[in-house]
Interface confidence: medium
């Protein structure tokens, strides 16, 4: 007789979740020799331990601490790239600019990127049918708490000039409710971070507005300045051109300004 299982509003755990996490871990440690010391079986055990047998609306950051400890990794100063609502371009950028890193370029972010997972109270099963939705069910679910935990840590360890890529096509270019706005901004350490530089990515080809003057960017500037961190903003008018110029900086057409710089 099938057991009764809680029905959540969100999609269930990604198929072959354990295999995918282990495979990603092994691949990551092979590609990054500095992480060769990581035991992927222990990583999976710690990941599993964070949510298996636990009520999936009562997950805490504490649950993920063993995993966070195993995945400890540092980014060189000036090399952290945060992003909000523009993941694909941020990842395309770090794939070209190999010395800059988004959270998903780090072990723990890479393991979980685009995956969903949850368990259920008092059983060792993974729930492949449904998982809690952040809005409809609860915010303290395994996936949301994971990203909050690792995003906090990523921001806390950043140093030098930190960059953030923001989506200029959205009504709220800076959204206080995003992971960047609610977690990362507040966990940058003023004693280690000299400045935050925002790159506002334009969507339309003919869009020549100065989106650095957008009210939500002013709001971001205010929050950052109050935390004694300097703020800069750049318009990236042509993201395609921007990526092309990152790939081929010697290209003559790249010497002309592809962005506009604001110092504050």
């Amino acid at each position: 007789v099938p057991r009764w299982r809680q029905q959540w509003s969100g999609s269930g755990t990604t198929s072959r979740f354990p295999e995918t996490v282990l495979a990603r871990c092994v691949k990551y440690t092979e590609v990054h020799p500095e992480m060769r010391h990581v035991d992927c079986q222990s990583v999976w055990d710690a990941f599993k331990g964070a949510f298996i047998s636990k009520y999936p609306c009562n997950i805490t950051e504490e649950d993920y601490q063993p995993l966070v400890k195993l995945g400890t990794q540092t980014v060189p100063c000036n090399k952290t790239l945060l992003w909000s609502r523009i993941k694909d371009l941020a990842h395309q950028f770090t794939q070209v600019q190999r010395d800059m890193f988004t959270l998903e370029d780090m072990l723990l972010g890479y393991l979980a990127d685009d995956l969903t997972w949850c368990g259920e109270f008092n059983t060792f099963e993974i729930n492949y049918q449904s998982c809690p939705d952040w809005r409809k069910d609860c915010s303290n679910n395994p996936v949301s708490v994971f990203w909050k935990t690792v995003s906090r840590r990523f921001a806390e360890t950043a140093c030098g000039v930190v960059h953030v890529m923001l989506n200029g096509s959205r009504s709220k270019i800076f959204d206080k409710n995003s992971t960047f706005g609610s977690v990362e901004v507040h966990n940058l350490q003023p004693e280690k971070v000299q400045a935050l530089e925002a790159w506002v990515i334009h969507g339309g080809r003919e869009d020549s507005r100065d989106l650095c003057q957008d009210p939500t960017i002013k709001e971001l500037e205010s929050i950052i300045s109050k935390r004694n961190i300097r703020f800069f903003c750049k318009n990236i008018y042509r993201p395609d051109k921007f990526l092309q110029c990152v790939k081929n900086p010697e290209d003559s057409s790249c010497l002309s300004g592809i962005h506009h710089h604001h110092h504050h």
Partner: antibody, heavy 121, light 107 residues
Framework: QVQLVQSGAEVKKPGSSVKVSCKAS????????ISWVRQAPGQGLEWMGG????????VYAQKFQGRVTITADESTSTAYMELSSLRSEDTAVYYC??????????????WGQGTLVTVSS | EIVMTQSPATLSVSPGERATLSCRAS??????LAWYQQKPGQAPRLLIY???TRATGIPARFSGSGSGTEFTLTISSLQSEDFAVYYC?????????FGQGTKVEIK
Amino acid sequence: QVQLVQSGAEVKKPGSSVKVSCKASGGDFSLYAISWVRQAPGQGLEWMGGIIPLLGEPVYAQKFQGRVTITADESTSTAYMELSSLRSEDTAVYYCARGHRVYSSSPFDYWGQGTLVTVSS
Amino acid sequence: EIVMTQSPATLSVSPGERATLSCRASQSVSSNLAWYQQKPGQAPRLLIYGASTRATGIPARFSGSGSGTEFTLTISSLQSEDFAVYYCQQYNNWPWTFGQGTKVEIK
């Protein structure tokens, strides 16, 4: 018993592309990395790149970056290696090989029979 | 990339004798080293991995040793079927790299 069966020999013109297939049977195709290794006539072995089918994200040796594309079709348990802009130096036997540990790219305990690719005008 | 150097290029040995093949890495590869045997017209065959662990079905006369940058493959008593080319391969750092091979021929 794991078997890797590769497609047949190819003769190609300089500047063209070649796509070699490697069909796996036995074992869980998705979880084991498939690598491609080539061997020019009378020469040693050269690793070109590999893929874990479950992840679908290949890794390439710098030398072949931009010229090689490695893919895997889980539904048919087949891996593919496509090499473009062929030149005479690409004449070689191309092997597919399977990593001996789950998820890991190496070392290689199962090998295909090899596919001879001849590049000649 | 890590350069693997094998020596000698050719080793002439009589059947029943001991053969010692060397492999040096340009930087440490820990114990992430494998040895392969290849006969003419055939695909390579895995002999040793982890520098010293014999692969399934490999006779006890084959043994591997070393770690870091210096490795050795020893064939304690050469049989006629052992005459072939032997390659070492590191799988510590991408890209995986092979040595140029040592040909073991009949003296």
